[in-house]
């Protein structure tokens, strides 16, 4: 069942290469090869290098394990980025006073525009460069929920480092809720993590768009480097042909 | 480099069994079935048959995905488990007093009994019956750490249901320390999350073992239902074969 | 100048000779084989007349068990009905009707094949694909099949009429 | 493992990954992909035996399941086993586009 | 997905995980496994088409990929994708052993 | 195979114009960005203007800006360059080429057509 | 505008010499190069795109380095149809510029 023939290796290459130029004009619905008659002339645009290298360490940070693939995850994903909304909105007014958090929101017209239906998205992750940091700090991250009530989402130990880091975390499922839902703007806030029995309480991390002095205040965003969404999701014309394909199996 | 005759699937099923049959004997690195001289007459024990059930359990709830599988995770497991200490042990004395924690411990040496040396340990889970609960709840799980110290592990967030349920943790990393530790007694704490600025932090969730008074007193133990580890370990002498046959790759 | 070809001797290897150029090399292929674009490898000429399995269609889970024919060219196959071709279910899809490569493959349109062995004042003769003779019992089952330029037809018992999907004929439901 | 970097520094014959870089341009005729202008996707190769077990096994012959069949297959295939995406780049008309594409980097293989 | 749901249920001539239950008895003539008396193995079947690509290509035959060759394997084969594990319980002379073996019942199939 | 074939050169008078067309065959016309590139008689080359496939975007070299329009009409693979107010520093063979990628390098190349503007 | 010197403007050489034409720009470009060939009364001819790559079916005496400001043409090995005029052509940024040229002589 096994052949012992030698094995022509550029033979081997050869289909694995034409394998692969079906595979990617696949993954990406093309019939064939776009057409590139519009493209202007110069090099890639900042904030799409700026995006791609997002994604590209992104990719480089995450563990090389095969998942079972539904028939969506085949198919290729868009990748966007929406920034948070900047410190000096006035939304961020009535959370200024908190030494154990910091507050980040987001326009929920740019996360539409970047995925017009909640079923689209494939990936949400809020990204935030953490500055260097003294001690271990233990932080959690939680989603505007009600009126004035937070919901728990998840939580990270942060070693302490002289570098600054991105730190990445999986809210695919909440900006899913956002999209379904009519409000303008949402929330996350990060705190540090309150032990029952703990008194120290304050969140001693830097995220780089917030002033490193009382958090909250208005900020210097240090270029397109503050808190951002990072969202994968099947381009709108994609999802209509894979839903018209349905039938195949 | 797929073939279009007819198949044999009588023959492809003869040789899928006989794979398993050598499959079988060399994950348990047997090199022939095990002699059936000794076993005594009658049925399996009743803790052997409720650890079998306890690991059947398990493998239904898990999900089924191929993990890429380092050469010692595809020889079999040995599966024991250790129940905590009973609640009327000394060592609860002084952790009596709090409503917003429940604490368990275990006895090392019983664990070094099941599990020689940290490094044949490939999977330890803390095991608890959640009795009914009338509300959300989200709790915390801490390992004794130092002195009067505890170290935050992970966290859940229990739905309300009528029937009671298996919760597991995973506490690998946990139980390898302590079968490298010179400890007698090694303990978790489970814990309502305190968020910094709520003030009700009362562990609601009962959990079978410790009366539903308060939680610490002298419990009464409902059979083998007590919080207990499920440990995963590679035998101690199929360990030795093991490194013996490093050599090969 | 460094001879590429005697520093290493598998170049151009198992199926051509390596030749040295200055500053550069080629392979010389042998009989079935062109060289690749760089001119530095050798692979397979899929040859017009090589015969192999022709597939009716791609929209069935199973096609590589819709099967026409076992032992065409891939003109004869993607000229006439086929939309694929190759063997052991390794599969060639017919190019498009009406792209390039379909011209190219079948200068003559669809129903023809070029005759490389008639030549009419030095172009090849065209010769109408005869489907009934290669696909017959596949394209017209329970019919008889009548070879037409180009085309075919199926003729079908009374009380049956021809069915262009299911390429048979079929009971009419009175 | 069967990874880079057991297979990509040794001989071994059975089955490994194999090392395949593709350059959009050269290896596709692509000009279409801006970023990146390649990458490793590797390929996996190599013969996994069968081994018909007897009841008298020994252990030489058990040992060769792990690599050769761990699976217990009847028909046993070097496959890929960890895969990472690959992001890219490619216009839209006049509009950019980062998109990923699953599962695009053989990093490792086995015998399944 | 290739599953045993959809496999089970359809009559996939291609690439599908089939039906095989192993009676540790009757199968192996094994006595000495005490718990389970055997189990649902199942296996892979069934050929993965390897599409010569153009790049003309036309949506159809693209849409082969994803379930025929989505790893654009030079050869692709059918593999196990998910897997469960199975406990046994057996006696090594007067003491039972409860052990768990990884990676025994496949559940779905897929072409890689 | 390609082939660009350009015409409409000749001789004219300083602050007339000339239309240049080209005429494209063996490729698929409105999936290429297309340009015109001149060449002074023994000088080097000058990039003079380029429209994308659709027609929808146009870039000019500064000393034809104002003066020289590009177009294309797709159903008739062709494309143009209308020179008004030509002056005697434009006197070059004109050749047209097709952009072949985002990298907008020039991979195929017509044979070229002479304009002199002369009193 | 970005500006692109070419050196030398001329240079002579034997059949099987190993020549090399430089380009440096007024700015860094990336990669956003190509070189082209040009005989006498002949359109020119695309040899290398994005500094380093040969376009299908130029020999592979041709190749091409360099990135950001500073890039090279080479000729591994000299052949008679070689003799011609060579340009570098930027397309980081409108207007795209053209390098005034090498003409590589008979010796």
């Known amino acids: 069942l096994s052949t012992c023939k030698t094995i022509d290796m550029e033979l081997v290459k050869r289909k694995r290469i034409e394998a692969i130029r079906g595979q990617i004009l696949s993954k990406l619905r093309l019939a064939s090869p776009p057409s590139q008659g519009e493209v202007p002339p110069g090099p890639l645009p900042e904030a799409v290098l700026a995006l791609y290298n997002s994604t590209r360490d992104r990719v480089a940070g995450e563990s090389a394990e095969p998942e079972p693939e539904p028939e969506a995850d085949y198919y290729a994903k868009e990748v966007t980025r929406v920034l948070m909304v900047e410190t000096h909105n006035e939304i961020y007014d009535k959370f200024k006073q908190s030494t154990h958090s910091i507050y980040m929101f987001f326009n929920t017209s740019e996360l539409r525009e970047a995925v017009p239906e909640p079923v689209l998205l494939s990936r949400a992750e809020l990204r935030l460069l953490r500055l260097k940091l003294k001690v271990e700090q233990h932080v959690e991250l939680y989603q505007k929920y009600s009126n004035n009530s937070w919901r728990y989402l998840s939580n990270r130990l942060l070693a302490p480092s002289d570098s600054p880091e991105w730190l990445s975390f999986d809210v695919t499922g909440v900006v899913r809720q956002w999209l379904s839902r009519g409000g303008e703007i949402e929330g996350f806030r990060l705190s540090a993590h309150c032990s029952c029995d703990s008194r120290d309480n304050t969140l001693q991390v830097d995220i780089n768009g917030f002033t490193t002095g009382r958090r909250g205040d208005l900020a210097t965003i240090h270029g397109m480097n503050r808190p951002f969404l990072l969202l994968m999701a099947t381009p709108l014309e994609r999802a209509q042909h894979l839903q018209s394909s349905r039938h195949r199996r | 480099l797929s073939t279009c005759k007819t198949i044999d699937m009588e023959l492809v099923k003869r040789k899928r069994i006989e794979a398993i049959r050598g499959q079988i004997l060399s994950k348990l690195r047997l090199a022939s079935p095990p002699s059936q001289g000794e076993v005594p007459p009658g049925p399996l024990p009743e803790a052997v048959l409720a650890l079998y059930n306890s690991t059947r359990d398990r493998v239904a709830g898990e999900s089924a995905e191929p993990e890429p599988e380092p050469e010692a995770d595809y020889y079999a497991k040995e599966v024991t488990r250790v129940l905590m200490v009973e609640t009327h042990n000394e060592i609860y004395d002084k952790f009596k007093q709090s409503t917003h924690s429940i604490y368990m411990f275990f006895n090392t040496s019983e664990l070094r009994e099941a599990v020689p040396e940290p490094v044949l340990l490939s999977r330890a889970e803390l095991r608890l019956l959640r009795l009914k609960l009338k509300v959300e709840q989200h709790v915390e799980l801490y390992q004794k750490y130092s002195n009067n110290s505890w170290r935050y592990l992970s966290n859940r967030l229990l739905a309300p249901s009528d029937s009671p349920e298996w919760l597991s943790f995973d506490v690998t990393g946990v139980v390898r320390q302590w079968l490298s530790r010179g400890g007698e007694i090694e303990g978790f704490r489970l814990s309502a999350h305190c968020s910094c600025d709520s003030r009700d932090n009362t562990l609601q969730v009962d959990i079978n073992g410790f009366t539903t008074g308060r939680r610490g007193d002298l419990a009464t133990i409902h059979g083998m239902n007590r919080p207990f580890l499920l440990l995963m370990a590679t035998p101690l002498e199929r360990a030795q074969h093991l490194q013996s046959s490093r050599h090969r790759r | 100048d460094i001879d590429e070809c005697s520093q290493d001797p598998s170049l151009c290897l198992p199926h051509g000779a390596c030749k040295n150029l200055q500053g550069s090399y080629v392979c010389v292929c042998d009989e079935g084989f062109t060289p690749t674009q760089d001119q530095h490898g050798c692979e397979e000429v899929e040859q017009p007349h090589h015969k192999k399995e022709c597939y009716l269609n791609f929209d069935d889970t199973v096609f590589c068990d819709s099967v026409l024919a076992t032992n065409v060219t891939q003109q004869e196959c993607c000229c006439s009905l086929g939309a694929g071709w190759g063997d052991h279910c390794e599969i060639y899809p017919c190019p498009v009707y009406s792209s390039a490569e379909f011209h190219s493959l079948c200068p003559d349109g669809k129903g023809y094949t070029q005759d490389n062995n008639i030549v009419n004042y030095g172009i090849p003769a065209h010769r109408d694909i005869d489907e009934c003779m290669l696909f017959g019992s596949e394209i017209c089952k329970e019919g008889k099949c009548v070879n037409t330029q180009p085309g075919y037809e199926c003729y079908c018992k009374q009380g049956f009429y021809y069915d262009g999907n299911l390429l048979e004929c079929v009971d009419v439901d009175e | 493992a069967l990874d880079t970097n057991y297979c990509f520094s040794s001989t071994e014959k059975n089955c490994c990954v194999r090392q395949l870089y593709i350059d959009f341009r050269k290896d596709l005729g692509w000009k279409w992909i801006h970023e990146p202008k390649g990458y490793h996707a590797n390929f996996c190769l190599g013969p996994c035996p069968y081994i018909w077990s007897l009841d008298t096994q020994y252990s030489k012959v058990l040992a060769l399941y792990n690599q050769h069949n761990p699976g217990a297959s009847a028909a046993p295939c070097c496959v890929p086993q960890a895969l990472e995406p690959l992001p890219i780049v490619y216009y839209v008309g006049r509009k950019p586009k980062v998109e990923q594409l699953s599962n695009m980097i053989v990093r490792s293989c086995k015998c399944s | 997905a290739l599953d045993t749901n959809y496999c089970f249920s359809s009559t996939e001539k291609n690439c599908c995980v089939r039906q095989l239950y192993i009676d540790f008895r009757k199968d192996l003539g094994w006595k000495w496994i005490h718990e389970p008396k055997g189990y649902h193995a199942n296996f892979c079947l069934g050929p993965c088409p390897y599409i010569w690509s153009l790049d003309t290509q036309y949506s159809k035959v693209l849409a082969l990929y994803n379930q025929h060759n989505p790893g654009a394997s030079a050869a692709p084969c059918c593999v196990p994708q998910a897997l469960e594990p199975l406990p046994i319980v057996y006696y090594v002379g007067r003491k039972p052993k409860v052990e768990q073996l990884s990676n025994m019942i496949v559940r779905s199939c897929k072409c890689s | 195979q390609v082939q660009l074939v350009e015409s409409g050169g000749g001789v004219v008078q300083p602050g007339r114009s000339l239309r240049l067309s080209c005429a494209a065959s063996?490729?698929?016309?409105?999936?290429?960005?297309m340009t015109w590139v001149r060449q002074a008689p023994g000088k080097g080359l000058e990039w003079v203007s380029a429209?994308?496939?659709?027609?929808?975007?146009?870039y000019f070299a500064d000393s034809v800006k104002g003066r020289f329009t590009i177009s294309r009409d797709n159903s008739k693979n062709t494309l143009y360059l209308q020179m008004n107010s030509l002056r005697a520093e434009d006197t070059a063979v004109y050749y047209c080429?097709?952009?072949?990628?985002?990298?907008?390098?020039?991979?195929?190349w017509g044979q070229g057509t002479l304009v002199t503007v002369s009193s | 505008d970005i500006q692109l010197t070419q050196s030398p403007s001329s240079l002579s050489a034997s059949v099987g010499d190993r020549v090399t034409i430089t380009c440096r720009a007024s700015q860094s470009i990336s990669s956003y190069l190509n070189w082209y060939q040009q005989k006498p009364g002949k359109a020119p001819k695309l040899l290398i795109y994005a500094a380093s790559n040969l376009q299908s079916g130029v020999p592979s005496r041709f190749s091409g380095s360099g990135s950001g400001t500073d890039f090279t043409l080479t000729i591994s090995s000299l052949q008679p149809e070689d003799f011609a005029t060579y340009y570098c052509q930027q397309t980081y940024t409108v207007p795209l510029t053209f390098g005034g040229g090498t003409k590589v002589e008979i010796k």
């Open positions: 080429a097709r952009v072949s990628s985002g990298h907008w390098d020039f991979d195929e």
């Open positions: 429209i994308s496939g659709s027609g929808a975007a146009t």
């Open positions: 063996g490729f698929t016309f409105s999936s290429f960005a």
